[in-house]
Interface confidence: low
């Protein structure tokens, strides 16, 4: 007996071939011997089966001795043995229809779980293997679960259902709702304007929700809500904003905040959360601000950084075009009685300069100049 696998909602064509290459009488029946369709001369006739409005054949092939049964919009309950009677012969075809669906919305928040459920006909024992967009393979039976979805899981999941050494492939598009980056860090000199951006890693026609940015300044004992906002059809409206700092928020995506000046008291880390309409849970992005200040007080040239720096970062003070005078894995370095000239304060990571501030030291009778 021939086995054919079909997908729920799809169309399947079951073949039936006569030895004579001409139009002769044929009938398709189900396992209960109920007629589905057949012919009467050149006319297609239909029986009383429940497939009535979804069954068809290709009249153009009858003259070649081919009498296919076409079933549209397949349902799981269409799984059956179909019998083609032609030339006193019977050809049996077993049709098995499978369906694969995501348990919930196919738009899921980062960190949530995805469950794929296989619908299969009674008596079948299929195996399922799914491949995620990042190439991860998951195997299972009637259900497959993936916990802690990551951004790389966004895209087309390809699932193969195997039964009777035949296979059928399903494709399910999953969108993981997340920010493009889980964390970002901004390095600024004192007084510079700061731009924070929170680009989303997905695009949808309508995007509605609300969000806020809580900020933990390094110098503060507790975190503070800097800004709260609404997002309606991808347009941003600010609800509340702290008086200090005087933040500005862009009216359009990507979510974009401007801090007029980087000051030591603002250095620290923030957490932007975005709650999307009709979704449980929130999207999160961490943002960090590191601020540098170079100063000269009397005979002391000091360079300091504030904010979340890694222990492997190096802070150096050097006179232009000379070797570093002082270089430490600390948040402050200084030089006593610095010689006149342009001094550079550098924050670097493995030789790569992240932040640089210049200060001009004048001969001792003058005051310093910051370019």
């Amino acid at each position: 007996k021939k086995v054919v696998l079909g997908k729920k909602g799809d169309t399947v064509e079951l073949t039936c071939t006569a030895s004579q290459k001409k139009s002769i009488q044929f009938h398709w029946k189900n396992s209960n011997q109920i007629k589905i369709l057949g012919n009467q001369g050149s006319f297609l006739t239909k029986g009383p089966s429940k497939l009535n409005d979804r069954a068809d054949s290709r009249r153009s092939l009858w003259d070649q001795g081919n009498f296919p049964l076409i079933i549209k919009n397949l349902k799981i309950e269409d799984s059956d043995t179909y019998i083609c009677e032609v030339e006193d012969q019977k050809e049996e075809v077993q049709l098995l229809v499978f369906g694969l669906t995501a348990n919930s919305d196919t738009h899921l928040l980062q960190g949530q779980s995805l469950t794929l459920t296989l619908e299969s006909p009674p008596g079948s024992s299929p195996s399922v293997q799914c491949r995620s967009p990042r190439g991860k393979n998951i195997q299972g039976g009637k259900t497959l679960s993936v916990s802690q979805l990551e951004l790389q899981d966004s895209g087309t999941w390809t699932c193969t259902v195997l039964q009777n050494q035949k296979k059928v492939e399903f494709k399910i598009d999953i969108v993981v709702l997340a920010f493009q980056k889980a964390s970002s860090i901004v390095y600024k000199k004192e007084g510079e304007q700061v731009e924070f951006s929170f680009p989303l890693a997905f695009t949808v026609e309508k995007l509605t929700g609300s969000g806020e940015l809580w900020w933990q300044a390094e110098r503060a004992s507790s975190s503070k809500s800097w800004i709260t906002f609404d997002l309606k059809n991808k347009e941003v409206s600010v609800k509340r904003v702290t008086q200090d700092p005087k933040l500005q928020m862009g009216k359009k995506l990507p979510l974009h905040l401007t801090l007029p000046q980087a000051l030591p008291q603002y250095a620290g880390s923030g957490n932007l959360t975005l709650a999307l309409e009709a979704k449980t849970g929130k999207l999160h992005q961490e943002v960090n601000l590191v601020v540098m200040r170079a100063t000269q007080l009397q005979k002391n040239l000091t360079c300091e950084v504030w904010g979340p720096t890694s222990p492997k970062l190096m802070l150096s003070l050097k006179l232009e075009n000379k070797e570093a005078k002082v270089s430490k894995r600390e948040k402050a370095v200084w030089v006593l009685n610095p010689e006149a000239g342009m001094w550079q304060c550098l924050l670097s990571d493995s030789g790569q300069v992240l932040l640089e501030s210049n200060i001009k030291v004048l001969p001792t009778w003058s005051t310093p100049v910051q370019p």
């Epitope: 493009q180 970002s184 951006s197 680009p199 309606k232 359009k252 990507p254």
Partner: antibody, heavy 120, light 111 residues
Amino acid sequence: EVQLVESGGGLVQPGRSLRLSCAASGFTFSNYGMAWVRQAPGKGLEWVATISYDGSITYYRDSVKGRFTISRDNSKNTLYLQMNSLRAEDTAVYYCAREEQYSSWYFDFWGQGTLVTVSS
Amino acid sequence: DIQLTQSPSSLSASVGDRVTITCRASQSVSISSHDLMQWYQQKPGKAPKLLIYDAFNLASGVPSRFSGSGSGTDFTLTISSLQPEDFATYYCQQSKDDPYTFGQGTKLEIK
């Protein structure tokens, strides 16, 4: 199929007014920002104005601020540009465009344009 | 306002040629790691058509011979193998700041 059809262009004297319309179909009009972009004869493209999906936010280029008003009627799927105190330099083909975005905002569908000639 | 300067202003090429058009912004059009730059194609008497958004993303229905690259202030539109229907005027456009601005256009003609 997304369609944007402008109308209302024509010859008008300097200092007079004109109202352009843009009939939208084939998409959910109330979900999208809309814009007017113009092109003077033989010249490049110039953004004129943008309106948010619900009409609450509008932006204009400086040279038309106070003279032009962008508006929309979501119940009629129609975008408007009311042009007052018209000047010779406003002569152009006026395109209505849909604004979409991924990170930046861009004009993903355009109408065929309507010509406005300001001349005495 | 952010000024966009395209080069060349006009260009003659043959079918099958690889063509590159550049667009330079007077200031960065990046926000964080995003480059807010678009490219459009316009044929005589017709409305512009979106080709590329966000510097390198290909708009729906646009052939893969078109590609965009660049970041910050310098951007490029490349047509890998010119087809007869590609002869048109090309514009870049930034949407980092209001007002949105376009380049002056590059006219691509048949050699």
